[in-house]
Each structure stands twice: as structure tokens, then as C-alpha cells.
Amino acid sequence: EVEKTACPSGKKAPEIDESLIFYKKWELEACVDAALLATQMDRVNAIPFTYEQLDVLKHKLDELYPQGYPESVIQHLGYLFLKMSPEDIRKWNVTSLETLKALLEVNKGHEMSPQVATLIDRFVKGRGQLDKDTLDTLTAFYPGYLCSLSPEELSSVPPSSIWAVRPQDLDTCDPRQLDVLYPKARLAFQNMNGSEYFVKIQSFLGGAPTEDLKALSQQNVSMDLATFMKLRTDAVLPLTVAEVQKLLGPHVEGLKAEERHRPVRDWILRQRQDDLDTLGLGLQG
């Protein structure tokens, strides 16, 4: 805590500018008006303040807004955002996507910090659901964001938001998460034709039941092996050799190389040897 000291004569800051970098911490505390700082927050980022000086500026804003900063200030926090604690952020009411983007930009290239996680949580809760524009923004900054949510949180994602999801956004999702997302994706893409539908649904198929895989096998989709191996084992096991052959198309040839990995291994063991022989791969059941 900086002590309350009077501002030396002629040092009162008429505006936020570069001259303030030469102020000692106590001078900043005494000579910068908090209301002025709040209205000129956009200038702070352009000035190379030290971390200690930023601490003082944060302190001034905290005193001015003990119940939490208004969005007009939050939007222009810039690097000062990195000084905020999750407790500070919980007091905020962020409703603008532009504000969210501005703050995510500050943390860009870094792991999701507790501050960012709290900010996102506050924002999404304020909106009531994870809409398409929000999801678009969040996955652009954090491709793993979707997979960091619990199945319960994912259940609030409307099917319309699924259009914003890219394949890489699902890379770290586990089967429980895909179980929630797959029906939403199926609904979102239901009006697309066969090949276009498969391109979109492919990355969600880790949540698909057997009957949907059987249906896909009738559509000449040529599923690649990496996708096949992400399918639920319990969904793959009931598939016949003919169905797997149709599902994978030319990629069925790769089963030989992956015969020791699940779900390939478990599936092979369920098949009749005569049927496996038709694959032309020398697989042993």
C-alpha cells in the first residue's frame, strides 16, 4: 500500500502521458487523478510503465471502483489486465465481445491463465450460453478451449454454435465430451449432403453410436484411420467387416499397421477369420 502524500507543486498530471514514467510510485499515487486515469486508460498501453508503476495505477482504479470496474475501463485495460486477480475479475460485468477480444489479445500466445479463465467464465455466464460468435473468438485464441469444459458446461452449447468449431478445437476432447457434442453437431449439419456432411461431422465422430457409423458406411465416406481410431470402442465392435471396409474405403489397408491398437485390436478379435481374409491384409483374428 502506498502512503497518502501530497502532490508536489507543479507535478499534478493534467493528462496521462509519457512524462509519468519519470514519476516515483508515491508521486503517481499523489499526482494522478483516478477519474482522469479511468477516462484515459487507452493511453496507458502506449507508455512503458514499470510493473511497480502499473501496481499503483491499478490501486487507484481499485479505489475509484471498489465494486468492480465499468466496461468502459475494462475494455482499455491492456497490459494492466495482467495485474488483475481472479477476485478482481469476478466483480466485473463484461458483456461486449470487443472487450473480451481486447483482453484475450493481451494474453495471446500464453497458456490460459486463471485470470483469463475467470474472465471467460464471467462473460459466458453473462450471455447465458456459448453462442457462435463467442465460441469463434475463444477457439481462435485457445484452440483447446472447448475441451476444457465439462460435459455439463458443454450441454449449454446450442447446436448453432457448432458451426464455429474447427477440427483442431476437438483434439483434446475426451469421449464424454464428444458424447455431448456429437448430437449437437448431427443436428447442426443435418441439412448438408453426404460428402459435405461427413467433412463437417468427422471430428465429432468420437461420440457417434454404432447405428450412425453403420449409416455412414453406406455413403462412400472413406474415413481416415486417425478418425476411425478415435471412435468409441463400444460403437466400433458391432460393425461387420463389410461395414468397416465400406466406412474406411481405401484407408482400410492401414488396419494392418494399427492392429495392436484399440479399437482396431478389439474389433479384429471379434471377427470371423474368413471375413477378415476378405480385407486382403493378412489380419489374424
Epitope: 484407408h251 492401414g254 494392418k256 499397421a257 491398437h261 480385407l279 493378412g282
Partner: antibody
Framework: QVQLQQPGTELVTPGASVKLSCKAS????????MHWVKQRPGQGLEWIGN????????FYNEKFKNKATLTVDKSSSTAYMQLSSLTSEDSAVYYC????????WGQGTTLTVSS | DIVMTQSPSSLAVSVGQKVTMSCKSS????????????LAWYQQKPGQSPKLLVY???TKDSGVPDRFIGSGSGTDFTLTINSVQAEDLADYFC?????????FGGGTKLEIK
Amino acid sequence: QVQLQQPGTELVTPGASVKLSCKASGYSFTSYWMHWVKQRPGQGLEWIGNINPSNGDTFYNEKFKNKATLTVDKSSSTAYMQLSSLTSEDSAVYYCARGWLRDYWGQGTTLTVSS
Amino acid sequence: DIVMTQSPSSLAVSVGQKVTMSCKSSQSLLNSSSQKNYLAWYQQKPGQSPKLLVYFASTKDSGVPDRFIGSGSGTDFTLTINSVQAEDLADYFCQQHYTTPYTFGGGTKLEIK
């Protein structure tokens, strides 16, 4: 040892068709798919398609769908590729190669399309 | 289609030198379930057919000398030849077998000074 035998050269006229052969030995013919690859002089390699010798299923690179037809004769352990409506663009070396990893290749057939 | 880009297109080295060549794919070739990269390297000596050197990005085929080392994952791959020998004069191609159509890189021509 594994061998894939291909005739050395084929000379055909434009507009004609040709059937290239690839005789496999030294392994179980129906346990590996057969692939065909095109290489034009001084250029890279292009995958044409593959065939499952066990049931005759074929898959083609879209680019060669109307050009190549793959077949096998299990009794002689031979894979075939028929190329139709030949033009000078089809002049190239054509290789057969075994399996998903293409771990064994034939010596290649040099196809020359010329009048 | 997955585009495979090799560099350099040619290089000349002296016997005993170490050489590295690069292969980049336009999309990831990693099967995260098995942690295998579906990428192979082939060597084609003048007047001969291609020969498999390395598969799954880093597994040497049987009979391939220890001086050949494949590495990389995802979209960036490298073939290194430690202590190049005169018989290594050849074109080297990478190829993805992640999805059809299976595609090859344009090749790197290795010349011996």
C-alpha cells in the same frame, strides 16, 4: 524373397489402350494390396490407385479415374493396370508397389505413347 | 488433397558430410491414437525404382543403414543422412499415407561433390 516383375517397355500409339502387368512372388499375394504409381521423366511421383487382391476392390486418385482400371488375377498372382485413350501425357514410368507402406516396388514399365 | 513440400530441391555434399532434407505437409499426419505419423521416405537411385527407407516418420525399414534417420511429427519432417556415402547419390521423396489420394513431395536430389 519378395519380387514384383514388370515388363521393361511398352510402345503404343495415341488413342490406343495398354494393359501393364505386375507379377508378384515371394509372399502371399492376397495379404497385401497393390498400388500403382506414375513417374514422368524428371518429375515426381503420383499415386494412381490401389486394389485389394483378395476381393478386387479398387480405389483411384480422382485424377486417374477415367484413365486407369486396376484388376488382379489371383491364380497367377498378377496385378494389372489398363490405361485407355492414351496421349503423350501418359508417357511415363509406371510402378506397381506392395502394400500401404509401399515396401517393395517393381522395376517399372516405361510407357511411350507415340505415333 | 494433402500437399507435400520438400526442400531443398537439390544439394551437393562431400562424402562423410552430414545432410538434412525437409518435408512439410499441408495438414497434420499424426494419428494421435497410436502416436504414429503416416509419413514415409523413399530413396530412388538413378535408373532404379524407389526403395522404402523410413516409415511412420522415424522407423527404419529393414536393411537400411543406421546413417539414415527420420524425424519430425505433425506437419514438419526431416531426413538426416549422417556421414554421406557415394552410394547415397539419389533422389529422396517423402510421401503421406494419411489420406487418399496419397501424395508425394517433389523430391530432393542429392549429389556428391
